[in-house]
Every structure is written in structure tokens, then in C-alpha cells.
Interface confidence: low
């Protein structure tokens, strides 16, 4: 199966901290179609559970194999359906979690089901807020069955869906008859192909018996593992807070697993993390329960002790799910669920054994999927066990697949099934692209499509002068970074080519085309300096430089002027086209701003080093500060601001400024304008009830004046939130969560 | 080792105001819901009030509503109860208790007390 | 808040089976845990939800419910079994209430 998990964030105590990530520990999953893969997917599906129109969800991509979607604003954004696609070609694969509102009228007891083809399925939902009508089941948004009020059962209605097959399985629903839809339960029954233990196409095949609520796949017989188990059979319990087929990923955060809900590929569904239950996720289990949802019961044997993340912990001398196992019947230790080999190696691969007797040599053999069996090369015998050696003949693709060691002795037998993936070494489709060059380095980006296995563990980037017969340089460099490539001949052209290595022995692919990237000319060194500069307005200013005089022509194309006005942290640059050029007007300049100048000479496109720095100080502009500015409050909407007009005025007033701000709130003030420059008082209304306020003004000749003083009034009584602050009356319209 | 200890107790005048505090230890205090349970003299257990683990959230028997606050500070892994105008029939031996509730499917729905603590003891007399 | 009733007292032979109730409307709804306390002493989980025990508590002791009643079962009653029993639930408003408790005797 996929490696892909949609991790989606329970703390619902604030929507707009809910999340979902969808993490694929797949090769170079979701980098999208120009490097290594088709891209991750996620998304809300409005086809079943429609939920009113909101502002769009955020989506953010982490890295090459992670996906976040935030931005939801209110509860209901976050009721229905989402999916999660990754992986690609024929392994394309969509994840699918189901959100329930924590305060709908009807909430399920459990979202997914899984089952097996023929079985009886029961969906029950809870009653969270009693209605006396009927309740409505939908199944993918269809009609599908009604119950009257008086049919629920100890405060749940049942749904039981006998001898199901899999065109049942999708979305159903609970909903009393004329609530919001938005109350209901939502479920996800998902019904495997097969009966129970069995898969394949004609439903032939033995599952491999999954453990620890392992679910298994029916299409290919491997066990979609719950989340914080791994192995072939999901044997094998990952550290606490760890999760992903290999136990890779991490729970984020420092509460580990708790509050996230982890779907996976079907036939799994969702679940808690191992150790967590409940609707969100937030409860340890109870004592003797373990794993994903707590579903699971120790029942530890022989002095076994229960772990709610990983099961029983033995004692020595003792092993098994239950410690029910002696070690004196013959054991095969530290087996790993899955190997990698790359194709046409010769891999040697270790199978140890224990148990009393003592397995020999001849007693462990190995077993292909065509049913080959290779007996060890050698052995080593130590005190605890015995490792048999087995050398394997060159890999071919048909040799991925299930392998088994088997131990027999006279004390019983054992067998550990493995699956070995045999992986093609990349080959890059393309040639490496250039990012920036200079007159000595090229930055190129190695990252390219390829065909083969990643993951891509070294790129190696080959280079040598174009049309030289020299040997190629080489450069061993990490695959998610950019490579310098230093030390270079300015205005040369190289030939470069990338060959992509995969983890493991024999992982080298061949090399990909060659491409070809030419330096830049050299870099300008010469410093210029500033001679002085005056004003010639409030918005313009004269500049002049010099530059050291120098033996030989002047390397450089113009002058690169940069303003910096560090109040507004802007940033002007004016550019001079004239090497010659020891002069510049700068116009448009902001009037009575402090700006720091400075200026460097370019080549190409390329900088030398800047001047050092002048400060300059512009003569400010616009009219003084309107006088005695006062204000009142009318009602618990309404301030009236009254002041008087500006002295010394240079002109006539084209209009006043008005900034309204909430006293100790840190988002943005809201200005507006006053366009009847005659008035000397204006009221502001639309604004919230029992809110203080902090007012102040300016008045606009051609460019705005002076801020008046700061007033601070409340507005009177309790009333609805309004819109926000305006001049004229707005109507304040219900939102779908009021 | 898994342990809760009760301290505060003591006498007190009807009317007066009494906080007992419950130092969590041997597990992660911050995701469990916990509560205090009371046993007047000779008399059965009464359960005083509950609160999530978030802090957020509190319940209250009716006996008691207004008059005491239950609250928790997961960073010192303490549960507190405030108890004000205190009355004679408040009385009690007071146990603080770690609330693993409320189940789940498979196991059935309960909630249920695994942890005590030892109790302090309440006297409101004058 | 609604009350849960339990027997006031039962008594049982030391070795014979005893079967205790305890009744209330929450028990619809929700599973009764089932504390055992002794004088002097704060009270022990012994049986939560449908019937299951925390580690440390004899299988002798079982628990059951149907509709508005669930009961405490102690088969092969020791002498360390004398003590009160209460039961625990939680009503609708999700606050919890106590049963009356019942006092077992071993003879």
C-alpha cells in the first residue's frame, strides 16, 4: 500500500487552529511533475456534505512530501468530507477523512467501519441534542432509510446494513428530519472485496494476519498497518509518537499523537494514534488497552506488562503477543519486515535464529516468492543464536515480493516472511537548469525528473570546459539543496550533467544529458564615493560621486543609486545607464523623509561595493495639525468627533483623514475620509457596543499634514457586533455561526 | 509510580473559605479529566465536581454549585478546589481523583476513577 | 442530578457467589464503574464499562448491565472481599453520581 497519512488536528476549541497534513513517506512523493513526482493533493469534498460558501482554505506545502490545508473560520468549514491524493501511475491513492461537528444534534460512535465482503455492518449515532422527528439516513447523499424518534437505543440510533458488498461502501448520514445538515453524523463504511482473511482477484489468497488492528489490503495482500505499527504483519510497534510504514514521521508537537485523527489508505479508514481514544483523540487509554483507539486488550501472560502504545513488554526468557511463547521453541530474531536491493546486485542477507537445541547451519533456509529456496553460505554460532548467511543470486524485478526464512529444529519450528523491494537506480530525464551565474560560479539545481526508485540519497553533478578533453570534475552534493560550482573561468561555457545515486549498494544510475552553462563577465571591485548632494524641492534631490582612479579601462556598465527610507522600510533605486555618469536628479521623493543614499557601480549584473552611506533629510510638506479634537459617544455604535481647522494654512483643504483604531487591538487602523472640508465635526458610526476607541486626524492640502492628537472614547451599552467602523449606517448581517 | 496527594485540609468557620490542592505524580496530568469526591463521616461517597483537561471545561454537583471552583495547572501537574462559604453539611473527607472516562465503543461508555489520593480532611465548625 | 440505588447490605458464605445491583436512569446510557472501600481507606477501581478490570483485580470479580441496572458479581468470595461496594455513573448533563453503596459481610 501507499505510505500516505491525512492527519487531521482534533483541538477544536478554535477553528481557525484546525488543520489537516497530509504526509506521504513514499520516494520523493508530491514535488510535483517537474522533479520527482505528481504532486500531493488535498482537498475538501463538497460532492456528499455541501457546506455553505466560505473564504477559500490554505494550502501550504511543507518540504517535498507534506501538505497542510488551514484557514477554516468557522465550524462549519470544518464538517464533511476531505481527501488526500499521492503517490503515482498505478499507485495513485486518495485518503479520506470525515469531520463531524463535536455539536450536532447526532454525533457517530465510531466514523469508519471496516468490513469484510457479506458482513453485517452497524453504523449507530449517538444523540448529542434531542430532536422529537424522525431521523433520516442518507448514503452518498441519497435517501436511504427512516426511523422514528422512539426507535433509538439507549440514546443511539442503529443502522444495520446485513450481507454488505463493496458498492456500499462510502458516506452515510444521520440527520433529524428538517434539522441543519451540518448536524448530522457522518460515517464511512468501507467494505473490503473479500471475505475475511482472504484477497486477490478471485478472492483466493490467504491474508498474512495482521496484527494489532492491521488491516488486510485485498487487492494486494499486504497489511495497511494502523498508525504507530509497522512490519509485514504489523508486528512490530514504533517509538511513542512515531508513525508512517517505516515509523519515519513524527507526531508535531510536544503532546505526541494526542488530539490528531490519522486516516490511511483503504481498507484502514481513520483512527486515533496508538495510545489515544475518544471523539478527539485526547484520552490515554485505560489500563490493559493498547494501541490505535485503545482497541486493542493485552491479556499480557508470564509476568508481561502492558504498554499502551506498543502491547505487552516481556520478560526474558519469554516473547510473543502475549508472551505466551517460550524461548526454547526456535525463534527468529530481529528479522526486518521489508529489505531493499537494487536491481542486478548480489545482496547477501542474515536471518538469526534461537532456541534450544541450537539451530545449525543446515537447519535455516530461505525461501524466494517463486518458491527457490537458498540454503546459507555460512554461519556464525554464538552463545544466543545462530546467523545463517545466504548469498543471493543477481536481482531481477520478479524477485520483489514476499520472502521467507524458515527455522526447524527439534524443538519446533518458526518462520518470518519479509518483503523485498528490488528498486531501478535513477536515471535523470533532463539536464540540470542554471540559476544564477557569475564571472567565476554557477549556481545550478541539480533536482530534475528521472525514471527509476528514489529516493534519491547523492546527486552528482559532472562538469568539464565545453569541447575539452580534460576529465570530467565532480561535485557529490545533498539532493534538496542548489549546487555552487566555484573556482570557474570567467565567460566560459561548461558542459554539466547530473548523475542521481538511490540508497544501498549498486544504487548508481547512469549518467543523465549534458546541458550547457556559460560564466558571466567579472564583477565591478571599484568603490565609488559621495561628493555631496543638495535639495532642489520637497520631493527632489541632486546627487554626486567619484570614483579612484585606476590604470586600464573602467570595468562597469552604469551607477546603481539605492534611497532607503527606514521609517517606512522602502526601498528606491534609480539607475544611471552611464558609466561616465558622476551626476543624478532623484525626483519624486517623499517630502520631510530621512533617507539614507548610497551608491555602486555595476557590470553585467553584477554590483561592485557600494559608498559608504549619507543621511539626508528632505523638507517636510501639507498642512498643520487640525486643533482641539474632541470626542463623544451617541450610542453604542456612534462617536462624534469635533474639532477645530488647521492654522497657518498654505492653501486650501482638500479633505480630512480620519484614523479609527480599538484601544489595545493589534490589527490595522481604519482610515477614512472626511470630504466635506468645511465640516468641522463628522460621526462615526457602525461600530461595536462597549468597545473603547482611539481617534485621530489629519488634514490634506496636496500631501497630508501633521496627526492631530489622540483621543480615546467608549461607545455606550450591549449591543449586536457590527460590521466595523463607517460613516454611514450598514445593516449587520448573521453569519452562519451566530 | 502513579500517585495523587491531597493537601488544605483543616478546620474552618461556617462561612469561611478553604483551597485544597492535589499534586499529580507518575503520569501526564495534562490530558486526563480529574475530580473531587467527598465522604461525610460514616456517610457513602458524593461526588463534588470534574474538570476536562484543558481546564475549560468544569461540572459541579448541584450541592455545591456557586459556592466552589475546581481548577488545574497542568505546567505544575495540580488540580485545585476552592471551596467558599462553607457550611457544616461540607463536612467530609475530600479525595482528589483521575477521571479515565468516557469509553469508547469497544469497551462501553462509563467514565470511571482509577487514581485516588489518600483524602484531607474538612471540618466546618464554629 | 439523578441518584443511583444499590442494595444496602448482602451477605455471603466465604467461597459462594454474591450478586449485587445498582439502579438509576444514567445507566441507560453509560456503563457504571464499581469502587470496593474499606474502613479507613480511599476507594479502589475493581470493575469499568462493559466488564473490564484494572490490573491487579482478581477475575473473581465481574461486572454486567442491562438497561437501567447493572450488577457487581464476586464469584468465590474471600474474606478480603468485606467491604462497601459503590457505583459510579455519569447522567445526562455529564455530571458523575454515586450509588448509595452497598455493604458486603463474608461469613
Known amino acids: 500500500a501507499v505510505d500516505l497519512t491525512l492527519l487531521a488536528n482534533l483541538r477544536l476549541t478554535d477553528p481557525q487552529r484546525f488543520f489537516l497534513t497530509c504526509v506521504s513517506g513514499e520516494a520523493g512523493a508530491g514535488r510535483g511533475s517537474d522533479a520527482w513526482g505528481p504532486p500531493l493533493l488535498l482537498e475538501k469534498d463538497d460532492r456528499i456534505v455541501r457546506t455553505p460558501p466560505g473564504p477559500p482554505l490554505r494550502l501550504a506545502r511543507n518540504g517535498s512530501h507534506q501538505v497542510t490545508l488551514r484557514g477554516f473560520s468557522k465550524p462549519s468549514d470544518l464538517v464533511g468530507v476531505f481527501s488526500c491524493v499521492g503517490g503515482a501511475g498505478a499507485r495513485r491513492t486518495r485518503v479520506i477523512y470525515v469531520h463531524n461537528s463535536p455539536g450536532a444534534h447526532l454525533l457517530p460512535d465510531k466514523v469508519t467501519h471496516t468490513v469484510n465482503k457479506g458482513d453485517t455492518a452497524v453504523l449507530s449515532a449517538r444523540v448529542h441534542k434531542e430532536k422529537q422527528t424522525d431521523v433520516i439516513w442518507k448514503s452518498n447523499g441519497s435517501y436511504f432509510y427512516t426511523l422514528d424518534w422512539h426507535e433509538a437505543q439507549d440514546g443511539r440510533f442503529l443502522l444495520q446494513l446485513p450481507n454488505v458488498q463493496p458498492p456500499s461502501s462510502g458516506i452515510y448520514s444521520a440527520t433529524y428530519l428538517e434539522a441543519s445538515p451540518l448536524g448530522s453524523a457522518f460515517f464511512r463504511l468501507i467494505v473490503r472485496g473479500c471475505g475475511a482473511g482472504r484477497w486477490g482477484p478471485g478472492c483466493t489468497k490467504e491474508c498474512p494476519g495482521c496484527l494489532h488492528g492491521g488491516v488486510c489490503h485485498d487487492h494486494d495482500g499486504e497489511c495497511v498497518c494502523p498508525p504507530g505499527f509497522t512490519g509485514t504483519r504489523c508486528e512490530q510497534a514504533c517509538r511513542e509518537g512515531r508513525f508512517g510504514q517505516s515509523c519515519q514521521e513524527q507526531c508535531p508537537g510536544i503532546s505526541g499523537c494526542r488530539g490528531l485523527t490519522f486516516c490511511l489508505p483503504d481498507p484502514y479508514g481513520c483512527s486515533c494514534g496508538s495510545g489515544w481514544r475518544g471523539s478527539q483523540c485526547q484520552e490515554a487509554c485505560a489500563p490493559g488497552h493498547f494501541g490505535a483507539d485503545c482497541r486493542l486488550q493485552c491479556q499480557c501472560q508470564n509476568g508481561g506488562t502492558c504498554d499502551r502504545f506498543s502491547g505487552c513488554v516481556c520478560p526474558s526468557g519469554w516473547h510473543g503477543v502475549h508472551c505466551e511463547k517460550s524461548d526454547r521453541i526456535p525463534q527468529i530474531l530481529n528479522m526486518a519486515s521489508e529489505l531493499e536491493f537494487n536491481l542486478e546486485t548480489m545482496p547477501r542477507i542474515n536471518c538469526a535464529a534461537a532456541g534450544n537445541p541450537f539451530p545449525v547451519r543446515g537447519s535455516i533456509e530461505l525461501r524466494k516468492p517463486d518458491g527457490t529456496v537458498l540454503l546459507s553460505t555460512k554461519a556464525i554460532v554464538e552463545p544466543e543464536k545462530t546467523t545463517a548467511e545466504f548469498e543471493v543470486p543477481r536481482l531481477v524485478l520478479a524477485d520483489s515480493g514476499f520472502w521467507e526464512c524458515r527455522v526447524s529444529t527439534s524443538g519446533g519450528q518458526d518462520s518470518r516472511r519479509f518483503k523485498v523491494n528490488v528498486k531501478v537506480p535513477p536515471v535523470p530525464l533532463a539536464a540540470p537548469r542554471l540559476l544564477t551565474k557569475q564571472s567565476r560560479q554557477l549556481v545550478v539545481s541539480p533536482l530534475v525528473s528521472f525514471s527509476g526508485d528514489g529516493p534519491i540519497s547523492t546527486v552528482r553533478l559532472h562538469y568539464r570546459p565545453q569541447d575539452s578533453t580534460m576529465d570530467w570534475s565532480t561535485i557529490v552534493v545533498d539532493p534538496s539543496e542548489n549546487v555552487t560550482l566555484m573556482n570557474l573561468r570567467p565567460k566560459t561555457g561548461y558542459s554539466v550533467r547530473v548523475q542521481l545515486s538511490r540508497p544501498g549498494e549498486g544504487g548508481e544510475g547512469a549518467w543523465g544529458p549534458p546541458t550547457l552553462m556559460t560564466t558571466d563577465c567579472p564583477e565591478p571591485l571599484l568603490q565609488p564615493w559621495l561628493e555631496g548632494w543638495h535639495v532642489e524641492g520637497t520631493d527632489r534631490l541632486r546627487v554626486s560621486w567619484s570614483l579612484p582612479l585606476v590604470p586600464g579601462p573602467l570595468v562597469g556598465d552604469g551607477f546603481l543609486l539605492r534611497l532607503w527610507d527606514g521609517t517606512r522600510g522602502q526601498e528606491r533605486r534609480e539607475n544611471v545607464s552611464s558609466p561616465q555618469a558622476r551626476t543624478a536628479l532623484l525626483t519624486g521623493l517623499t517630502p520631510g523623509t530621512h533617507y539614507q543614499l548610497d551608491v555602486q557601480l555595476y557590470h553585467c549584473t553584477l554590483l561592485g561595493p557600494a559608498s559608504p552611506p549619507a543621511h539626508v533629510l528632505l523638507p517636510p510638506s501639507g498642512p498643520p495639525a487640525p486643533r482641539h479634537l474632541h470626542a463623544q459617544a451617541l450610542s453604542d455604535s456612534e462617536i462624534q468627533l469635533t474639532w477645530k481647522h488647521p492654522e497657518a494654512l498654505p492653501g486650501p483643504i482638500s479633505k480630512y483623514v480620519v484614523e479609527v483604531q480599538v484601544a489595545g487591538g493589534a490589527g490595522d487602523p481604519l482610515w477614512i475620509d472626511v470630504d466635506r472640508p468645511e465640516e468641522t465635526s463628522t460621526i462615526i458610526r457602525g461600530l461595536n457596543a462597549s468597545t473603547r476607541y482611539l481617534f485621530r486626524m489629519r488634514a490634506s492640502i496636496q500631501g497630508l499634514g501633521d496627526w492631530s492628537n489622540t483621543v480615546e472614547e467608549s461607545t455606550l451599552g450591549n449591543g449586536l457586533q457590527a460590521e466595523g467602523p463607517v460613516q454611514e449606517s450598514r445593516a449587520a448581517e448573521e453569519g452562519l455561526d451566530q | 509510580e502513579v500517585q495523587l496527594l491531597e493537601s488544605g485540609g483543616g478546620l474552618v468557620q461556617p462561612g469561611g473559605s478553604l483551597r485544597l490542592s492535589c499534586a499529580a505524580s507518575g503520569f501526564t496530568f495534562s490530558i486526563y479529566q480529574m475530580g473531587w469526591v467527598r465522604q461525610a463521616p460514616g456517610k457513602g461517597l458524593e461526588w463534588v465536581s470534574r474538570i476536562y483537561p484543558s481546564g475549560g471545561v468544569t461540572k459541579y454537583a448541584d450541592s455545591v454549585k456557586g459556592r466552589f471552583t475546581i481548577s488545574r495547572d497542568n505546567s505544575k501537574n495540580t488540580l485545585y478546589l476552592q471551596m467558599n462559604s462553607l457550611r457544616a453539611e461540607d463536612t467530609a473527607v475530600y479525595y482528589c481523583?483521575?477521571?479515565f472516562g468516557p469509553g469508547d465503543l469497544w469497551s462501553g461508555y462509563y467514565d470511571a476513577f482509577d487514581i485516588w489520593g489518600q483524602g484531607t480532611m474538612v471540618t466546618v465548625s464554629s | 442530578q439523578s441518584a443511583l440505588t444499590q442494595d444496602p447490605a448482602v451477605s455471603v458464605a466465604l467461597g459462594q457467589t454474591v450478586r449485587f445491583t445498582c439502579q438509576g436512569d444514567s445507566l441507560r446510557n453509560y456503563h457504571p464503574s464499581w469502587y470496593q472501600q474499606k474502613p479507613g481507606q480511599a476507594p479502589v477501581l475493581v470493575i469499568y464499562?462493559?466488564?473490564n478490570r484494572p490490573s491487579g483485580i482478581p477475575d473473581r470479580f465481574s461486572g454486567s448491565s442491562s438497561g437501567n441496572t447493572a450488577s457487581l458479581t464476586i464469584t468465590g468470595a474471600q474474606a478480603e472481599d468485606e467491604a462497601d461496594y459503590y457505583c459510579n455513573s455519569r447522567d445526562s448533563s455529564g455530571n458523575h453520581v454515586f450509588g448509595t453503596g452497598t455493604k458486603v459481610t463474608v461469613l
Open positions: 481523583a483521575r477521571d
Open positions: 464499562g462493559k466488564n
